[in-house]
């Protein structure tokens, strides 16, 4: 899996989308997890409704919410009030039994709020994201 980069501004919301084949993953719950280290486990943050038919209902864990369009095949994760500690590697997963198939690998980048003048001297204007192998950036 290639990694897709999603960039958000500190204090704002970031929406991450994970498209998938709706028939291939029919009946499967989904999850959003945070990768702990390069080879470490992916720690579950939030998962869709226990009843797959109700996957469209938004479920929340703290500032992270998840909802699944099971017919259209798009899993959407919303990170509210984005903070620097939210930056890192994540995965969208499709669950079956004790298995978790990776739908998409995600790198969340948190940009400084350009309207926040508290540290104007250190203001960094975001340019093109540093790319790594086959990275795809979405804002």
């Amino acid at each position: 899996h290639n990694t897709t980069v999603f960039q958000g501004v500190e204090g704002q919301s970031l929406q991450v989308s994970c498209p998938y084949d709706s028939m291939k993953h029919w009946g499967r719950r989904k999850a959003w997890c945070r990768q702990l280290g390069e080879k470490g486990p992916c720690q579950r943050v939030v998962s869709t409704h226990n009843l797959w038919l109700l996957s469209f209902l938004r479920r929340r864990n703290g500032s992270t919410a998840i909802t699944d369009d099971t017919l259209g095949g798009t899993l959407t994760i919303t990170l509210r009030n984005l903070q620097p500690h939210d930056a890192g590697f994540y995965q969208c997963q499709s669950l079956h039994g004790s298995e978790a198939d990776t739908l998409r690998k995600v790198l969340v980048e948190v940009l400084a709020d350009p309207l926040d003048h508290r540290d104007a001297g250190d203001l960094w204007v975001p340019g093109e994201s540093e790319s790594f192998e086959d990275a795809h950036v979405e804002h």
Partner: antibody
């Protein structure tokens, strides 16, 4: 009516290659996982592996990884099981089976099966 | 791999008898279990899925129960057409292994 029709019986010599087929009809073949199951003479069922014809995502049992290749051609609704070099121990009946999908559940259960293909490997 | 162990490996019974076959998983599989019936020279037939749900068209004399590691298939009143080999299969993870089978014979 959903059907999985397998290719006919084969008699081969050790070291020969072989590709058997499983053609689906009566359902959207692309959208169902297709598994292959081995049954050696007088023995039980052994799960070999599975493929999703939509994108050819394939999973193998460790017991069969590297021994066989599972593939599919969604344009003709057909899944394949192939060997590059057969052994006498490959003599068995091979079944293909469709993974059941219900309206609310993705399962690992098999609701439709092919009739089986008998492969005999003998010198 | 999750290993599936069936018992007994064979059982003799008469028409009208109640028969129970058990299946044990080497680790917990919740209710991700199926039961199949196979007759000589034929493909297996799905009887029970999700441990206890009856597949469409399967007679009500067949029932399944269990969760975690221990499961049972029960035939409440054996009919002549029920004499066959029965297999359990776990669907929790890959590879989706089968049990070794239980042959149900006429006494």
């Amino acid at each position: 009516e959903v059907q999985l029709v397998q290719s006919g019986a084969e008699v081969k010599k050790p070291g020969e290659s072989l590709k058997i087929s499983c053609k689906g009809s009566g359902h959207s073949f692309t959208n169902y996982w297709i598994a292959w199951v081995r049954q050696m003479p007088g023995k039980g069922l052994e799960w070999m592996g599975i493929i999703y014809p939509g994108d050819s995502d394939t999973r193998y049992s460790p017991s069969f990884q590297g021994q066989v290749t599972i593939s599919a051609d969604k344009s003709i609704s057909t899944a394949y099981l192939q060997w590059s070099s057969l052994k006498a121990s490959d003599t068995a009946v091979y079944f293909c089976a469709r993974q059941r999908t219900f309206y609310y559940d993705s399962s690992g259960y098999f609701d439709y099966w092919g009739q089986g293909t008998l492969v005999t490997v003998s010198s | 791999d999750i290993q599936m162990t069936q018992s007994p490996s064979s059982v003799s019974a008469s028409v009208g008898d109640r028969v129970t076959i058990t299946c044990r998983a080497s680790q917990g599989i919740s209710n991700w279990l199926a039961w199949y019936q196979q007759k000589p020279g034929k493909a297996p037939k799905l009887l029970i899925y999700a441990a206890s749900s009856l597949q469409v068209g399967v007679p009500l004399r067949f029932s399944g129960s269990g969760s975690g590691t221990d499961f049972t298939l029960t035939i409440s009143s054996l009919q002549p057409e029920d004499f066959a080999t029965y297999y359990c299969q776990q669907a929790d993870s890959f590879p989706r292994n089968f049990g070794q089978g239980t042959k149900l014979e006429i006494k």
